[in-house]
């Protein structure tokens, strides 16, 4: 494939990184899905500058990112190490709480009214950050 | 009402180590990032470093990394900060301050009176 | 790191004058931007946050406004407790930095 050199329209650009935010809502599996068939992922927060810049972009509303820990351990959708990366869990989370009523705990992380993470039930409706790196090989065929 | 106390500022040589304590009250020390802030004579305000509610992010300054570890106590709600190989730029009041959510905000909200470290031969 | 540049770097004015300080970044921090009053001895103030949100308590005769790089603080109708430093800071990057200072006089 040909390497991404700039973003596509209706993405930001910031630091390598191209972002595209949704303006409506879906669990986060679809989320997960939309991203992938955009040849990105949900976001993956790496740094102070990232948070902010995220924060920044969403304002205070419940967003979707690239983090779950619906197989055990916590992971972010990219493979970046999430035991030695950035956090910005709110106090007292995640707590996988189960009294929702909704079936079982909570595995999908969230950005917060202020920014600040929280772990969700997958399944509730909140807008996404997708997010795919720039000059990494896109999947688009080459123009010939 | 919230209260931060800072101690351990002093007369040291250079080279040498100290190690400022905060006393935090009047709120869930372990919900809330805290910052160190400094200000040399005669200058203005610098920032120093941070670390998480829990622990989990801490930054510094250029001018301190390496020599400067932050750490925190939330049983004891107590935030310290150990500085080693001191030197003459390093004299300043240094101020402990709160950050207004857990970490990430870094707007100071309440700050200590500071105390003063003087690095002197 | 981004630099922080205030100005004026001193003024002098009149109780009931209207004063305007300016913050300059040296790149986008978007709203992130904080205003401190410090006082001889005295533990420094958090005024306003995120460039326009007052901090409780603090009159509202302090204002502040911008986004992206330039950002100002206005102080309506001075008043003797309002003689003081004034310091910007952001909070988009690390390190955190702040500006020089403002150092307001009465005239």
């Known amino acids: 494939g040909s390497e991404r050199t700039c973003c596509p329209v209706n993405w930001v650009e910031h630091e390598r990184s191209c972002y595209w935010f949704s303006r409506s809502g879906k669990a986060w599996a679809d989320a997960d899905n939309y991203c992938r068939l955009e040849d990105a992922h949900l976001v993956v927060v790496t740094s102070w500058e990232e948070q902010k810049f995220v924060q920044h972009h969403i304002g205070p509303v419940n967003t979707w990112m690239g983090l779950h820990d619906q197989n055990g351990p916590w992971k972010w959708v990219d493979g970046t190490d999430y035991e030695t990366g950035f956090k910005n869990w709110r106090p007292e989370q995640p707590d996988d709480w189960y009294g929702h009523g909704l079936g079982g705990g909570e595995d999908c992380a969230h950005f917060t009214d202020d920014g600040r993470w929280n772990d969700d039930v997958c399944q509730r409706p909140y807008r996404w950050v997708c997010e795919t790196e720039l000059d990494k090989a896109s999947q688009e065929p080459p123009l010939l | 009402q919230v209260q931060l106390v800072e101690s351990g500022g002093g007369v040291v040589q250079p080279g040498r180590s100290l190690r400022l304590s905060c006393a935090a009250s009047?709120?869930?020390?372990?919900?809330?990032?805290m910052h160190w802030v400094r200000q040399a004579p005669g200058k203005g305000l610098e920032w120093v470093t941070v670390?998480?509610?829990?622990?989990?992010?801490?930054y510094y300054a250029d001018s301190v990394k390496g020599r400067f570890t932050i750490s925190r106590d939330n049983s004891k709600n107590t935030l310290y900060l150990q500085m080693n190989s001191l030197r003459a730029e390093d004299t300043a009041v240094y101020y402990c301050?709160?950050?207004?959510?857990?970490?990430?905000?870094?707007?100071?909200?309440?700050w200590g009176q500071g105390t003063l470290v003087t690095v002197s031969s | 790191d981004i630099q922080m540049t205030q100005s004026p770097s001193s003024l002098s004015a009149s109780v009931g004058d209207r004063v305007i300080i300016s913050c300059r970044a040296s790149?986008?921090?978007?709203?992130?931007l904080n205003w401190y009053q410090v006082k001889p001895g005295k533990a420094p103030k958090l005024l306003i946050y995120?460039?326009?949100t007052l901090q409780t308590g603090v009159p509202s005769r302090f204002s502040g406004s911008g986004s992206g790089t330039d950002f100002t603080l206005t102080i309506n109708s001075l008043q003797p407790e309002d003689f003081a430093t004034y310091y910007c800071?952001?909070?988009?990057?690390?390190?955190?930095?702040f500006g020089q200072g403002t150092r307001l006089e009465i005239q």
């Open positions: 009047g709120f869930t020390f372990s919900s809330y990032g």
């Open positions: 790149q986008s921090i978007f709203s992130y």
């Open positions: 301050a709160r950050d207004s959510l857990s970490g990430i905000a870094a707007a100071f909200d309440y």
């Open positions: 670390i998480w509610y829990d622990g989990s992010n801490k």
């Open positions: 995120d460039t326009s």
């Open positions: 800071q952001q909070s988009y990057g690390i390190p955190i930095t």
